[in-house]
């Protein structure tokens, strides 16, 4: 969480951002809130990016003002216009690119004062893994697949019964470049699995951590997955 304060002749207002991560090719949110003002026509929101000459986005007098917008963000940004009056200056970024990573500044002017806060935005690819029993294999085998990751993640297997066990000798992980030549498909195979046990396939890079669990019993198979972004720090 980054909290910034204005340093103008007018009063300073508190602006708060949250570091976040964008998933390449999908839409992302750059989060920013500020002390709300009841005078909508006086509110100005400017998003800037370090190293970029033009503005990322500008909202003033109740609408977008994009004449100064940098070419790399053309047609890809929007604020939540209906939420500005209650202090939400968050930016929606469409079709996130690897090059969108960097330091952004959320700069706010209201009738009460000015303020700004920086935000670190990471970009990469992350996806939910799915763990299945590989019936084609000669022994009891689990296959963990996740379609899109970048940068290259680590994959670690764990088991509920053999807690702390190292499965690196009985697993094999491969990374296959996807058609857009940036993200990769992750496939990890775990051999010699036993029934009545829960196995977890954990995929992690510096942006996200995802886990796929599978519980195999004689009568049924239960699966569960979850994904967590690693760098949601507020400013």
């Amino acid at each position: 969480l980054i909290i910034g304060f204005g340093i103008s002749g007018r009063h300073s207002i508190t602006v708060t951002t949250v570091a976040s991560a964008g998933n390449i090719g999908e839409d992302g949110i750059l989060s920013c809130t500020f002390e709300p003002d009841i005078k909508l026509s006086d509110i100005v929101i400017q998003w800037l990016k370090e190293g970029v000459l033009g503005l990322v986005h500008e909202f003033k007098e109740g609408k977008d003002e994009l004449s100064e917008q940098d070419e790399m963000f053309r047609g890809r940004t929007a604020v939540f216009a209906d939420q500005v009056i209650v202090g939400n200056a968050s930016l929606r970024l469409k079709n996130v690119q690897l090059t969108d990573a960097g330091t952004y500044k959320c700069y706010i002017i209201t009738s009460k004062g000015k303020g700004n806060a920086n935000l670190e935005y990471k970009t990469g690819a992350f996806s939910m893994p799915e763990v299945n029993v590989d019936y084609n294999a000669s022994s009891e085998t689990l296959r963990c697949e996740a379609p899109r990751w970048f940068p290259q993640p680590t994959v670690v297997w764990a088991s509920q019964v053999d807690q702390g066990a190292n499965f690196s000798e009985v697993s094999n992980t491969s990374f296959e470049l996807n058609s857009e030549n940036v993200t990769m498909k992750v496939v990890s195979v775990l051999y010699n699995v036993t029934i009545n046990n829960t196995y977890s396939c954990m995929i992690e890079n510096d942006i996200a951590k995802a886990t796929g669990d599978i519980k195999v019993t004689e009568s049924e198979i239960k699966r569960r997955s979850h994904l967590q972004l690693l760098n949601s720090k507020a400013s």
Partner: antibody, heavy 117, light 107 residues
Framework: EVQLVQSGAEVKKPGASVKVSCKVS????????MHWVRQAPGQGLEWIGA????????EYAPKFQGRVTLTADTSTSTAYMELSSLRSEDTAVYYC??????????WGQGTTVTVSS | DIQMTQSPSSLSASVGDRVTITCQAT??????LNWYQQKPGKPPKFLIY???QLAEGVPSRFSGSGSGTDYTLTISSLQSEDFATYYC?????????FGGGTKVEIK
Amino acid sequence: EVQLVQSGAEVKKPGASVKVSCKVSGYPFTSYWMHWVRQAPGQGLEWIGAIYPGKSDTEYAPKFQGRVTLTADTSTSTAYMELSSLRSEDTAVYYCTSTWTHYFDYWGQGTTVTVSS
Amino acid sequence: DIQMTQSPSSLSASVGDRVTITCQATQDIVKSLNWYQQKPGKPPKFLIYYTAQLAEGVPSRFSGSGSGTDYTLTISSLQSEDFATYYCLQFYEFPPTFGGGTKVEIK
């Protein structure tokens, strides 16, 4: 659940003052503007003013400037509207209304103020 | 101050009718307009925000549209519980101002 609970009806004499309270629960009281709106019998809605409890910033409609005072007690999440020098035209239902998710999204039940000699 | 002219001031309609209420601002309010429904003895109820977005729990027969200075509230098929007074509110310019209201009565 968001709730705005106002104080009870008041009967006042011309020239007197009235203070209406509005107790808030269900959202962060200090971080959002609280407004006051009134409605005379059979009439429309009229904005009086607003307060930002976190900083005690206030804004008033020019018509009420100097005659209305908005305050807030952050320890009890209660907003107050005091109207002085009452006249018969001030007979109305007074509402508090929040701007939490949107402008005037939640409303108090209203407080009837009757000014009569 | 921005003046909001609401029309008609009252209308009579039957259950099932399509009802349209308009609000005209004295200047561009950039879609910064909400609609409220009020029944006798009750506070206004938040209906539509930012011109066209339905508030939580509001039936889909209500819709809003408009831009610039002209805005419309439409009830596609009037129900018995919709007989009430409707107000528009502009919050673009300070101070916020309401329309005069439209009373929807049973024909």
